[in-house]
Interface confidence: low
């Protein structure tokens, strides 16, 4: 089930070619696999990567360019994702999600 994530909608505007950082706040005890999704208007949500909080490692979905996204941060409090070399097609709503059980 979906679990332990603090929702906080935030708008970020960046120029093409620049970077952006998104924060996912985790409730205490939120561990396991934390997923990042991109939802663009008219499309189904697309998983970009997931973060294994047990080993602090990142697994990219196939087709995602290494270096495009970087996820890091606390495995107990929050998780950040950096988006690099932004293009117009990166526009959309980014979500983090986790499951337990």
């Amino acid at each position: 089930k979906s679990s332990n994530l603090e929702g906080r909608t935030k708008s970020v505007i960046r120029q093409t070619g620049s970077s952006a950082e998104i924060t996912c706040d985790l409730a205490e005890g939120s561990t396991g696999y934390i997923h990042w999704y991109l939802h663009q208007e008219g499309k189904a949500p697309q998983r970009l990567l997931y973060y294994d909080s047990y080993t602090s490692s990142v697994v990219l979905e196939s087709g995602i360019s290494p270096g495009k996204y970087d996820t890091y941060g606390s495995t107990r409090k929050n998780l950040r994702m950096i988006l690099r070399n932004l293009i117009e097609n990166d526009s959309g709503v980014y979500y983090c999600a986790t499951w337990d059980g």
């Epitope: 047990y54 080993t55 602090s56 990142v58 290494p66 970087d70 606390s74 495995t75 107990r76």
Partner: antibody, heavy 125, light 106 residues
């Protein structure tokens, strides 16, 4: 098997320089962040420096910042630590250490699963 | 920069349980990882992350975290568990180690 072999230690006078090397084998060297950790005689472990898998990010303990430089040569599977302006308090065994998780890890992550045997650096006049 | 504080020494009777702690502000946000160093040997990763052990490390080693404290518990301590135990975690500038705890099995 995974192996890290340090070299380059020795006796140096205060103010002098040394370059430590660490030859890595048994794993894909350029997929892993690496660290240098030191241990003064009879003392605990002290992290010295880390470098990202690609070598683009480096970081240093405050005690060595500006004096030590970490680098890596992927073609030679070798990690380096250039130590300048050495002080008596730099005397220690220096360990080359592999990060536990691969490319996705940023250089400052701290799970360290393979340690070399260490090389002794003595700074004394 | 952060500091991690460990008790200098603890002792435990053979087969009994011992817990060693690691305290520091960085542990409010990041898990510790734990290393054992026996005399004359290099450190060995014992536990990392939430509660993960590398292959070859027995399940009598476990960890927990609360607030600014990380704990390593050895349940049913064996003679071979003797050694110096170090915690480490993230630091504002990289990585920080605790000062180490000497564990003696009686």
């Amino acid at each position: 098997q995974v192996q890290l072999v340090e070299s380059g230690g020795g006796l140096v006078q205060p103010g002098g320089s040394l370059r430590l090397s660490c030859a890595a084998s048994g794993f894909t060297f350029d997929d892993y962040a690496m660290h240098w950790v030191r241990q003064a005689p009879g003392k605990g472990l002290e992290w010295v420096s880390g470098i990202s898998a690609g070598g683009g990010s480096t970081n240093y303990a405050g005690s060595v910042k500006g004096r030590f430089t970490v680098s890596r040569d992927t073609s030679k599977n070798t990690l380096y630590l250039q130590m300048n302006s050495l002080r008596a308090e730099d005397t220690a065994v220096y360990y080359c250490v592999k990060s536990y998780v691969d490319t996705a890890m940023r250089y400052y992550y701290y799970y360290m699963d393979v340690w070399g045997q260490g090389t002794m650096v003595t700074v004394s006049s | 920069s952060y500091e991690l504080t460990q008790d200098p020494a603890v002792s435990v009777a053979l087969g009994q349980t011992v817990t060693i702690t690691c305290q520091g502000d960085s542990l409010r946000n990041y898990y510790a990882s734990w290393y054992r160093q026996k005399p004359g040997q290099t450190p060995v990763l014992v536990v990392y992350g939430k509660n993960n052990r590398p292959s070859g490390i027995p399940d009598r080693f476990s960890v927990s975290a609360s607030g600014n404290t990380a704990s390593l518990t050895i349940t049913g301590a064996q003679a071979e568990d003797e050694g110096d135990y170090y915690c480490n975690s993230r630091d504002s500038s990289g990585v920080v180690f605790g000062g180490g705890t000497k564990v003696t099995v009686l």
